[in-house]
């Protein structure tokens, strides 16, 4: 059996949206499946790796990689998203190319990032952790550690820097899969909203999902000693 | 608010070395992203830009001049000092210190300027 | 280095008149680019970053255009305390390079 709930709730985009959360039914009347799995529940992709799982985190993240920082015109805000979700006319798609990228170090001025601009994260303002020296940040924002400190300066200049973010990464369902959501959605969903974070890339959703012990590598799940909890 | 003041001598004499000081308020040079720097302008000409130093020590010169530089800064003290060793009448400029940031590589508050002659 | 040059080397407008200042890269340097405007005895000051990003504080009748080699600097509708040189420097590359200036006359 199923429940469904239906809720008109803050999108991406800033408009209220009806959305449906779809919720399926313990047979037994008892806790749901998500809560079954934080308990310790026989949940093989907790256990070992999920093929399926893996070409899912792996196809968003491809598609984050060709992400970019959609500005809305009006100021209301911005989302990180692909360019053909981003409004050609109410507002701007923050996307380094051509070599408008800031440079990778500066050392090398003339090498350029290609990969980005990202929503409120940018190498140039980060200050823990730096990029800079050994720790230089690659030019595959999927591979951008979460920023813990910013600069201490109010206006940066940049358009994807000082807008107001409307969208972070969002855990949501038993599959982990991950979406740049509103809090409200997030929430609406049923979902773990990542607060600190601004890429997909940068949580570990099925770790979320699991529960229990986190996982060694949070790539690789291992809690094989569901086995003998239930 | 940001403001920097050159110092230094108004005439040198041929080979010898001029010190230039760059004194800061407004802002700390420990401060993440920002540098100080020497740029000059030979008068009636353009500008050239001769070297930076930035928060975290790093140094960058014009290599055209590099070995006849040397940038240090003293954080404590708001100041960036600049050495230019065997002047030439050449080198007759004026001289400017200005901030730089890592966001763009531009500059973007300057000092007045100090006139250097070079002659004997 | 990468080399900029400025055209015209010197122009006499008169008040109201729109202005326009070229700046060449000899090579690309996508948008790494900015304008300093610089009055008599005076030092210069930043008027637009990154070719086309305006700066706080200055008026909005100065606006950048350009990318890859070639920039355009637009003064709309002049006015006597605009009578400056006028610098574009690149920021793609080490070392940084400023173009030789342009003098601008109020007839």
């Known amino acids: 059996a199923q429940h469904v709930t239906t809720q008109l709730v803050l999108r991406n985009k800033g408009v209220y949206e009806s959305v449906k959360y779809i919720q399926q039914e313990n047979f037994w009347i008892g806790p749901s499946s998500i809560d079954l799995i934080h308990l310790g529940a026989k949940f093989s992709p907790c256990i070992r790796k999920d093929q399926q799982i893996e070409q899912l985190v792996l196809r968003e993240r491809d598609l984050e990689r060709d992400s970019g920082c959609c500005v809305q015109n009006d100021h209301s805000g911005c989302i990180q998203t692909q360019r053909k979700d981003c409004s050609e006319t109410l507002a701007t798609f923050v996307k380094w190319q051509d070599d408008t990228g800031p440079p990778m170090d500066k050392s090398d001025l003339g090498q350029k990032r290609t990969s980005g601009a990202v929503c409120h994260q940018d190498p140039r303002t980060c200050e823990e952790p730096a990029s800079s020296g050994a720790h230089i940040w690659p030019d595959d924002i999927t591979k951008w550690p979460i920023c813990t400190e910013q600069a201490k300066s109010n206006r940066t200049g940049f358009l994807h820097m000082d807008c107001q973010i409307k969208g972070r990464p969002c855990c949501i369902s038993t599959k982990g899969s991950c979406e740049i959501t509103t809090r409200e959605y997030c929430e609406f969903m049923h979902g773990y909203f990542h607060e600190e974070a601004t890429l997909c890339s940068q949580v570990h959703c099925l770790d979320k999902v699991c529960g229990l012990l986190p996982f060694l590598n949070p790539e690789v799940p291992d809690q094989f000693y569901r086995l003998w909890l239930s | 608010q940001v403001t920097l003041r050159e110092s230094g001598p108004a005439l040198v004499k041929p080979t010898q070395t001029l010190t230039l000081t760059c004194t800061f308020s407004?802002?700390?040079?420990?401060?993440?992203?920002?540098?100080v720097g020497w740029i000059r302008q030979p008068p009636g000409k353009a500008l050239e830009w001769l070297a930076h130093?930035?928060?975290?020590?790093?140094?960058y010169y014009n290599p055209a001049l590099k070995s006849r530089l040397t940038i240090s800064k003293d954080t404590s003290k708001n100041q960036v000092v600049l050495t230019i060793t065997n002047m030439d009448p050449v080198d007759t400029a004026t001289y400017y210190c200005?901030?730089?940031?890592?966001?763009?590589?531009?500059?973007?508050?300057w000092g007045q300027g100090t006139l250097v002659t070079v002659s004997s | 280095e990468i080399v900029m040059t400025q055209s015209p080397d010197f122009q006499s407008v008169t008040p109201k008149e729109k202005v326009t200042i070229t700046c060449r890269a000899s090579?690309?340097?996508?948008?790494?680019l900015h304008w300093y405007q610089q009055k008599p005895d005076a030092s210069p000051k930043l008027l637009i970053k990154y070719a086309s990003q305006s700066i706080s504080g200055v008026p909005s009748r100065f606006s950048g255009s350009g990318s890859g080699t070639d920039f355009t600097l637009t003064i709309n509708s002049l006015e006597a305390e605009d009578a400056a040189t006028y610098f574009c420097?690149?920021?793609?590359?080490?070392?940084?390079?400023f173009g030789q200036g342009t003098k601008l006359e109020i007839k």
């Open positions: 200005a901030r730089i940031t890592t966001y763009y590589y531009g500059m973007d508050y």
């Open positions: 407004g802002f700390s040079l420990s401060t993440f992203a920002l540098g």
């Open positions: 130093i930035w928060w975290d020590e790093d140094k």
């Open positions: 090579q690309s340097i996508g948008n790494h």
């Open positions: 420097q690149q920021s793609y590359n080490w070392p940084l390079t």
